[in-house]
């Protein structure tokens, strides 16, 4: 519905009786009268374009604000072309300025420029050129501005001329009201249009029967916009659970349909795996063996836990195991499947078993996995490990049974050492290595094998109990292939990668670290 206008000031309708203040008196703006169709037309005009430094003010009478919060100012005016005057009149302007001042009392003839705040510079869309002016074809411009929020009892408008040739024919000041309205199952009364501040222009609505404010929602309120039009509700009345909107009323859901909460949606048919509902139902109960998770919407079919993961494999790689599995064949009707991996280790000699979560390392946290693989490392050699992969979904917590699959694997080797070059010279290489701490107690010695690159006929071996060695008596500027292998009581562990390390050339001699 369009806004309703309430006029506070209408210069054109006042017939020259308003007696606005001009400053300086008589030398700038002045009231003029013209007769059109035997009716007097009044205007305020100024045209001191040939004189520089014009500062002419026209102030309205004091206007009582009443209930208005934002006012609209409609101006109708003419502006003459500066080229109508000799040499374009260097001091001539084609705009004027609009100001306002709020006050709780009428200052009468006490005019003070400093109390006024500029609203805008008013420029014409069309100027009146000489030929039009002399033919009495003046170009009438219409401009509108608004000001708000207003808080004092009343206000003045003022027009500042700085050297234009202007005639102000109409000044209309009004505010807007939003009309009475029934919308969104709420009734809104006629309301004064607000200012920019929404809290000053919001209006509470009254809900119709079986309509409510949704839980946690805001009261049904609409903004009465500055232009007197209602905007979209902030909050609204919605048909309560078990009811749907039919025209401007709320009607109970039919049997076999439901509506879970106060919302804009219509009643929905009961979903899969539910029992039929009575009239006005707010939900549909699940069939036996099917469930709803607390966060599931009532519109979702009832679901059940998944079956176990399908086809679990455990592949050993030194002191690591890669577990892979495929999703359950029955998802239970849900997509929120996650997997949990648990680990058990057993000593082959005693057969004693226990959890091993504290001693192993997973490639990602083993609970709430969404991918179907995980790598387990830091496994101890010569141990038997059993891994359990459980599939769960949003309703698994509602039943006591679990859906899982297990796989076992024996670890026979240590993890390969990680090798680093610590330093080098023309005739030596300093090498260090590391293996995971849980495996270190099982290592008897480390065996370092090295040979010249390209020489496959001979190689050298050094054994040490430590984690580093310096290889001496090497040829300068030569690349050597170096490998480190852990030796355990049971035999050889996994060997490291073969590394290529080069001694320094004679020119770059000296023991340089890398």
């Amino acid at each position: 519905a369009q806004g309703k206008e309430v006029v506070l000031l209408d210069f054109a309708a006042a017939g020259g009786e308003l007696g606005w203040l001009t400053h300086p008196y008589g030398k700038g703006w002045d009231l003029m009268q013209n007769i059109m169709n035997d009716m007097p037309i009044y205007m305020y005009s100024v045209c001191n374009v040939m004189s520089g430094d014009q500062d002419n003010w026209l102030r309205t009478n004091w206007v009582y604000r009443g209930e208005a919060e934002r006012i609209f100012i409609e101006l109708k005016f003419t502006v003459r072309d500066c080229n109508s005057f000799p040499g374009g009149a260097s001091s001539c302007k084609e705009t004027f300025n609009l100001y306002y001042a709020e006050s709780d009392l009428d200052y009468g003839t006490n005019f003070q420029k400093r109390l006024f705040t500029k609203i805008d510079t008013i420029a014409p869309d069309e100027i009146t050129v000489s030929s039009d002016f002399e033919a009495r074809h003046v170009k009438l411009n219409v401009e509108e501005r608004s000001v708000g929020p207003l808080t004092r009892k009343g206000f003045y408008l003022a027009f500042q001329d700085i050297g234009a040739c202007v005639a102000l024919l109409s000044v209309r000041v009004y505010y807007k009201k939003c009309p009475e309205l029934l919308q969104g199952l709420a009734h809104f009364p006629e309301t004064i249009a607000g200012s920019d501040a929404p809290s000053l222009a919001t209006v509470a609505g009254t809900c119709v029967d079986h309509a409510v404010v949704p839980p946690g929602g805001e009261e049904p309120r609409m903004h009465c916009a500055v232009d007197g039009e209602w905007l979209v509700p902030i909050g609204q009345c919605l048909c309560q659970a078990g009811y749907e909107k039919v025209e401007d009323a709320c009607q109970a859901c039919s049997p076999g349909f439901f509506k879970f909460e106060a919302s804009e949606s219509p009643c929905l048919e009961c979903p899969e795996h539910t029992l039929p509902s009575p009239e006005g139902a707010t939900s549909c109960e699940c069939e036996e063996g099917f469930f709803r998770a607390p966060q599931d919407p009532a519109s979702m079919p009832c679901t059940r836990p998944p079956s176990a993961p399908h086809y679990l494999t455990a592949v050993g790689m030194g002191a690591k195991v890669e577990l892979r599995w495929t999703p359950p064949q029955d998802s239970g009707g849900r997509e929120d499947i996650v997997y949990s991996v648990t680990c058990e280790q057993c000593w082959p000699e005693s057969g004693e078993c226990g959890p091993c979560e504290a001693s192993v390392r997973y490639s990602e946290p083993p609970h709430g996995l969404t991918r179907t693989s995980v790598t387990v490392s830091d496994l101890e050699p010569h141990m038997n490990y059993t891994f359990t992969v459980e599939a769960r979904n949003g309703v698994s917590g509602l039943v006591t049974s679990r859906s899982f699959r297990t796989a076992s694997v024996s670890i026979n080797q240590t993890e390969p050492p990680k090798v680093r070059l610590e330093g080098r010279s023309t005739t030596s290489l300093s090498v260090s290595w590391s293996i995971p701490p849980p495996q270190q107690s099982r290592v008897w010695k480390y065996e370092v094998t090295y040979r010249k690159k390209g020489d496959s006929n001979s190689y050298n071996v050094r054994r040490t109990e430590g984690f580093s060695v310096t290889l001496d008596d090497l040829a300068p500027d030569t690349t050597y292939l170096v490998q480190v292998q852990a030796l355990t009581q049971e035999g050889q562990g996994a060997g490291s990668k073969v590394h290529e390390f080069q001694t320094l050339s004679p020119e770059g001699s000296g023991n340089l670290a890398v």
Epitope: G16, E17, G19, T22, Y25, G26, K27, D30, L31, M32, Q33, N34, I35, Y42, Y44, S45, C47, N48, V49, M50, S51, S84, F85, P86, G108, T109, R136, C165
Partner: antibody, heavy 120, light 108 residues
Framework: QVQLVQSGGGLVQPGGSLRLSCAAS????????MHWVRQAPGKGLEWVSV????????YYADSVKGRFTISRDNSKNTLYLQMNSLRAEDTAVYYC?????????????WGQGTLVTVSS | SELTQPPSVSVAPGQTVTITCQGD??????ASWYQQKPGTAPKLLIY???NRPSGVPDRFSGSSSGTSASLTITGAQAEDEADYYC????????????FGGGTKLTVL
Amino acid sequence: QVQLVQSGGGLVQPGGSLRLSCAASGFTFSSYAMHWVRQAPGKGLEWVSVISPAGNNTYYADSVKGRFTISRDNSKNTLYLQMNSLRAEDTAVYYCARASVGATGPFDIWGQGTLVTVSS
Amino acid sequence: SELTQPPSVSVAPGQTVTITCQGDSLRSYYASWYQQKPGTAPKLLIYGENNRPSGVPDRFSGSSSGTSASLTITGAQAEDEADYYCNSRDSSGTHLTVFGGGTKLTVL
């Protein structure tokens, strides 16, 4: 009947003073700007002074500035022109006139005129 | 800022006569025209674009162009013999309002 009736003219010596009055009737005196216009014998019209409706604004022609004072008493519907330091060139018929709109006219109602003669 | 009028103009009865008024202020503001007969106060004839107060015969009309304003009497009569003055707001800011020097119209 809308009219302006003037009084107070006469013969005065150079350097002397005189006060002219202009009594208004038939309209809302306090709503209009009022002017004094003079006409030297055998000459044209010369604007002298203006006063705003409430009496808070006044303007004077350069020839009388500092010597003449325009005033009004809206409770008595009367306009005044106090003339001091009169000179021979101030000799003229003085008219009061109403500005029909605004400050500067046009002058739609005129008094009958009163002669001021400055002579020794 | 001054307004300039011809000192005198004459017309035969029933003929049309035009009295002119020149001045820079007339680019900015309309002229008003006054008629003054001997021994009486001036009387408003024309103001604004071409407005006549009630009681003024329609043979009197006004017009303006650039720095010039004109009073035209179409079908002059003996009783129109009088002095005619133009008047305008002063756009220079020197004065508030200015009068022309007056034109004596003689109806032959």
